[in-house]
Interface confidence: low
Amino acid sequence: EPHSLRYNLTVLSWDGSVQSGFLAEVHLDGQPFLRYDRQKCRAKPQGQWAEDVLGNKTWDRETRDLTGNGKDLRMTLAHIKDQKEGLHSLQEIRVCEIHEDNSTRSSQHFYYDGELFLSQNLETEEWTVPQSSRAQTLAMNVRNFLKEDAMKTKTHYHAMHADCLQELRRYLESSVVLRRTVPPMVNVTRSEASEGNITVTCRASSFYPRNITLTWRQDGVSLSHDTQQWGDVLPDGNGTYQTWVATRICQGEEQRFTCYMEHSGNHSTHPVPSGKVLVLQSHWQ
């Protein structure tokens, strides 16, 4: 799975007048990483793990970058012509990735009032616009503004692509946190489903990186996809991830089933606990 940096900025206008503030969130490897605090006008790390990524470095650079990006987006919103009465939003999502083979990907997406109207591959500079007439009009508006000075635009987008990757590399190089491997804690529980059946759930938590295989096996053979239910691999807020897989089995056959986990080259199997343990609720689901 590639390392990624994702910027999500939103600016607002009211009755055609662009508001002074902006909302900004940055995700690193899918984890909430930074948020722009509008009262303090600062980029703020999201939790201890985010602070650990940069160690004792200040967040001034991030603050400067987000402030500049917010200013650029406000200027872009000011050039959108169809702003009617009330509140409108312009959202920019920018993502860059570094893959295991060191190849890179960068893209940028614009949304107006939550609707995607313009995307750009920042490496090839190829633009994509949805078919709707509203999207076409908005895209033309924004592209015209961005192309007012062709040289500036070219520099701007090359710089955006380069800056995003540069920041991502800086985080990867400076951070032990992002190069670490944290093995998952695996926990198997059972709950009564219906008469004669039980639901067995295998949970993996607090692991890093994100890639994991978690599956139920019967007599050592993996069950088919359609007999298992998977949870998403989600950030747990501490820079690590959590997920689960569940299946329904016949009571009395528990010893035939194991949960198989594979993560960062290590693997383990986990049996179903014996006894009637009734799990009423779990914060994982």
């Epitope: 939103t10 009211w14 009755d15 007048s17 508001q19 002074s20 503030g21 909302l23 969130e25 948020r35 605090d37 509008r38 009262q39 999201q46 009330g86 509140l87 939003s89 959202q91 939550g114």
Partner: antibody
Framework: QVQLVESGGDVVQPGRSLRLSCAAS????????IHWVRQAPGKGLEWVAV????????YYADSVKGRFIISRDNSKNTLYLQMNSLRAEDTAVYYC??????????WGQGTMVTVSS | AIQLTQSPSSLSASVGDRVTITCRAS??????LAWYQQKPGKVPKSLIY???SLESGVPSRFSGSGSGTDFTLTISSLQPEDFATYYC?????????FGQGTRLEIK
């Protein structure tokens, strides 16, 4: 210190009018959107109206649109709410509130409006 | 208008408990959400803005999370002064709307 102080609350008959005021101090009033929020006795918070920092644009809740008028005088650091055609359901404590831009960390102490025959 | 639905509507808990209140928006509101605390006869007090930023002077036992449509206010260890009514509010678009409130009572 930062302060908003409402005044003008009263007991009025249905169909009558009333004007509320909100005096601001301790911050740059002309830089902020200011809102009216109300709370009927024993009920939750209900947003009523907002006026932009420059006084040009205004926005209202559907329940008061066409009956209430929000205005401001930046030279006097004062916000107003002109309430016309009052109804029993307008009975509430009226707060003025502000913040960065529309999350309210500055609240007045509230003024009570009772509409009753 | 965007509707905000808070759950639960009321909640009984003890001092020291960890309490979670959720707020669901009828459509995506990014992180334009605030949380307020109100005690009987008092003015609402801002706790959290931008979904997770702690208002100045608010104890760190209060925290907010979420973005899009699902948001959470958490009090990590209830103190006697925390028993009150809590409201969420969206400021993503006008009309601004509040949740119906969650009343937190002593068990």
């Amino acid at each position: 210190q930062v302060q908003l102080v409402e005044s003008g609350g009263d007991v009025v008959q249905p169909g009558r009018s009333l004007r509320l005021s909100c005096a601001a101090s301790g911050f740059t009033f002309s830089n902020y959107n200011i809102h009216w929020v109300r709370q009927a006795p024993g009920k939750g918070l209900e947003w009523v109206a907002v006026i932009r920092y420059d006084g040009i644009n205004k926005y209202y809740a559907d329940s008061v649109k066409g009956r209430f008028i929000i205005s401001r005088d930046n030279s006097k650091n004062t916000l107003y709410l002109q309430m016309n055609s009052l109804r029993a359901e307008d009975t509430a404590v009226y707060y003025c509130a502000s913040g960065p831009p529309d999350a309210f960390n500055i609240w007045g102490q509230g003024t009570m409006v009772t509409v009753s025959s | 208008a965007i509707q905000l639905t808070q759950s639960p509507s009321s909640l009984s808990a003890s001092v020291g408990d960890r309490v979670t209140i959720t707020c669901r928006a009828s459509q995506g509101i990014s992180s334009a959400l605030a949380w307020y605390q109100q005690k009987p006869g008092k003015v609402p007090k801002s706790l959290i803005y931008d979904a997770s930023s702690l208002e100045s002077g608010v104890p760190s036992r209060f925290s907010g999370s979420g973005s899009g449509t699902d948001f959470t206010l958490t009090i990590s260890s209830l103190q006697p002064e925390d028993f009150a009514t809590y409201y969420c509010q969206q400021f993503n678009s006008y009309p601004i709307t509040f949740g119906q409130g969650t009343r937190l009572e002593i068990k």
